[in-house]
């Protein structure tokens, strides 16, 4: 699991590859702060609850965020 409690940032390794939006349980976007100087995106998968860190600079990940946001706006009244 690419997470660590010993460093200020949560993510150690990040992926440029998107996942299927439908396989996501949760998508957390953690803004840069005094504790971690970069934006972090943590995807929790429905299958096994596995967590993955995604690269916010990757175009494919930006496309994923757009797709998730569009999906959510469809669902909300």
């Amino acid at each position: 699991v690419p997470l660590s409690r010993t460093v200020r940032c949560t993510c150690i390794s990040i992926s440029n590859q998107p996942v299927n939006p439908r396989s996501l349980e949760k998508l957390e976007i953690i803004p840069a702060s005094q504790f971690c100087p970069r934006v972090e995106i943590i995807a929790t998968m429905k299958k096994k609850g596995e967590k993955r860190c995604l690269n916010p600079e990757s175009k494919a990940i930006k496309n994923l965020l757009k797709a998730v946001s569009k999906e959510r706006s469809k669902r909300s009244p």
Partner: antibody
């Protein structure tokens, strides 16, 4: 040199199953997603979907849900596309294409595999 | 899904001519368009990405421009080896779409 080498041409009967391979070399297989594209005879390119090579999770375009299966063998750096219950309209050239996910376009393609479905 | 309308579907031009192909998206694709060249029996080859960025090794006679929904691919001086079919690809979405293709022939 980055290369995607696909398996050879296949001739199948309707109702059969075909499995195409795409073996990569020249880069770390799990660093890039792998996409599949279909081209029917005399027609244009149609995107079929992709597989996340880190976790082996496939995503299919709407027109390619059901009979299509994308899989991986990371030990041999090979992606596979399997198509079951073949029909004559599945006759096409199938391409694998590496996606440069950071920028999100297809930068390297396999040479294509011709699948002919005929009774 | 984002639809891409490519025109013309075929085009006949002479060596040395300036050739222009257009792709129109049904929504803003934020310049995330790539252009591919495909010769008969061969795989598509990437020429340009992000509207106008030329791939290494691709001749400078190939260029691209556009923004929003409208994009143009240009060959400034057509060469005999440019005879091929050209496709646009939008990648501003998780769901990719190609244009229908433009078959380029020599007069």
């Amino acid at each position: 040199e980055v290369q995607l080498v696909q398996s050879g041409a296949e001739v199948k009967k309707p109702g059969a199953t075909v499995k195409i391979s795409c073996k990569v070399s020249g880069y770390t297989f799990t660093d890039y997603s792998m996409h599949w594209v279909r081209q029917a005879p005399g027609k244009g390119l149609k995107w079929m979907g992709w597989i996340n090579t880190e976790i082996g999770e496939p995503t299919y375009a709407d027109d390619f849900k059901g009979r299509f299966t994308f899989t991986l063998d990371t030990s041999t750096s090979t992606a596979y596309m399997e198509l079951s219950s073949l029909r004559s309209e599945d006759t096409a050239v199938y391409y694998c294409a590496r996606n440069y996910d950071y920028d999100a376009y297809f930068d390297v393609w396999g040479q294509g595999t011709t699948v002919t479905v005929s009774s | 899904d984002i639809q891409m309308t490519q025109s013309p579907s075929s085009l006949s031009a002479s060596v040395g001519d300036r050739v222009t192909i257009t792709c129109k998206a049904d929504q803003d694709i934020n310049k995330y368009i790539a252009w591919y060249q495909q010769k008969p029996g061969k795989a598509p080859k990437l020429l340009l990405h992000h509207t106008s960025t030329l791939q290494p090794g691709i001749p400078s006679r190939f260029s691209g421009s556009g923004s929003g929904r409208d994009y143009t691919f240009t060959i400034s001086s057509l060469q005999p080896e440019d005879i091929a079919t050209y496709y646009c690809l939008q990648y501003d979405s998780l769901l990719f779409t190609f244009g229908q293709g433009t078959k380029l022939e020599i007069k």
